[in-house]
């Protein structure tokens, strides 16, 4: 079996302030089992944007139904974008662990740029 890859096909996305950003991410395998998380930025100071396993993320919706069998689409939409949302977003696959899931593989990142609303 080929090792899972996390594909973020868009290097960059430009969204107008107040609109919804779609950040695309797919995995190439169902193995290993474990959730997807999205982060803004990299390294220890990265900001959690969405966690499939747990948490409340009112601005974020998933594009696909994550409970459906064979789903490998982990794209998200972030609503009501503001300039403060600009940055590079990473889709990260975790593998099931005990007691905690373990980071397995990250996508290459998608840079979100925000175009100001015309005044």
């Amino acid at each position: 079996e080929e090792e899972l890859q996390v594909i973020q096909p868009d290097k960059s996305v430009l969204v107008a302030a107040g609109e919804t950003a779609t950040l695309r991410c797919t995995a190439t395998s169902l193995i290993p089992v474990g959730p997807i998380q999205w982060f803004r930025g990299a390294g220890p100071g990265r900001e959690l944007i969405y966690n499939q396993k747990e948490g409340h993320f009112p601005r974020v919706t998933t594009v696909s139904d994550l409970t459906k069998r064979n789903n490998m689409d982990f794209s998200i939409r972030i609503g009501n974008i503001t300039p403060a949302d600009a940055g590079t977003y990473y889709c990260v696959k975790f593998r099931k662990g005990s007691p905690d899931d373990v980071e397995f593989k990250s996508g290459a990142g998608t840079e979100l740029s925000v175009r100001a609303k015309p005044s």
Epitope: E1, L30, I31, V33, G34, N51, Q52, K53, E54, G55, D65, L66, T67, K68, R69, N70, N71, K96
Partner: antibody, heavy 119, light 110 residues
Framework: QVQLVQSGAEVKKPGASVKVSCKAS????????INWVRQAPGQGLEWIAM????????HYNQIFKDRATLTTDTSTSTAYMELRSLRSDDTAVYYC????????????WGRGTLVTVSS | DIVLTQSPDSLAVSLGERATINCRAS??????????IFWYQQKPGQPPKLLIY???NRDSGVPDRFSGSGSGTDFTLTISSLQAEDVAVYYC????????FGQGTKLEIK
């Protein structure tokens, strides 16, 4: 830490109904399927049904389709399995189990609820 | 419905020896490039525990003496060097269609 806490043991008379609960914690309840499995004393495992708490989609073992009903309460992260028209051969331990990979498998299990059917 | 038949129903193996449990499906459980077979271990008084998923992938925390193999209709769970704590009943499960379990194999120490 994923936890599934089931309701206590029940004793029922033939012809009665039983409703077993399974309270989930440590994860987003609506993102993962819940399965129900039973095990008669000294016997093997028998799959009953499964439910997607996000939209209440259900799949039933044909053997139980007319007697079992699965429901969820997303406000309390609780799944329920009701079994009607109980017979003595329904005496079993009833387990709930969470499917962490949408593979129609059972990654995390409750401790089980013993249902005894006796006149 | 897919029927899973495990063999043997029970077996006794010496400590440190290899234990092999087979699971045969009444039709292929392969689909979308995966073999939809899972293995569980159940010790007395406990719920089952997932060992192997999609035929050959060890679950988190499962010792590497456990391995799964096979494709299509024939699958095997192997314990390379039996330990005392491996005494249990082992079940295969398929999910190519809706889930069904094999009847179980009781593993004891010789």
């Amino acid at each position: 830490q994923v936890q599934l806490v089931q309701s206590g043991a029940e004793v029922k008379k033939p012809g009665a109904s039983v409703k077993v609960s399974c309270k989930a914690s440590g994860y987003t309840f609506t993102n993962y399927w819940i399965n129900w499995v039973r095990q008669a004393p000294g016997q093997g495992l028998e799959w009953i049904a499964m439910i997607d708490p996000s939209d209440s989609e259900t799949h039933y073992n044909q053997i139980f389709k007319d007697r079992a009903t699965l429901t969820t309460d997303t406000s309390t992260s609780t799944a329920y399995m009701e079994l009607r028209s109980l017979r003595s051969d329904d005496t079993a331990v009833y387990y709930c189990a969470m499917d962490y990979g949408s593979l129609y498998a059972m990654d995390y299990w409750g401790r089980g609820t013993l249902v005894t059917v006796s006149s | 419905d897919i029927v899973l038949t495990q063999s043997p129903d029970s077996l006794a193996v010496s400590l440190g020896e290899r234990a092999t449990i087979n699971c045969r499906a009444s039709k292929s459980v392969s689909s979308s490039g995966y073999n939809w077979i899972f293995w569980y271990q159940q010790k007395p008084g406990q719920p089952p525990k997932l060992l192997i998923y999609l035929a050959s992938n060890r679950d988190s925390g499962v010792p590497d003496r456990f391995s799964g193999s096979g494709s299509g209709t024939d699958f095997t769970l192997t314990i390379s060097s039996l330990q005392a704590e491996d005494v249990a009943v082992y079940y295969c499960q398929e999910s190519r269609e809706l889930p069904t379990f094999g009847q179980g194999t009781k593993l004891e120490i010789k």
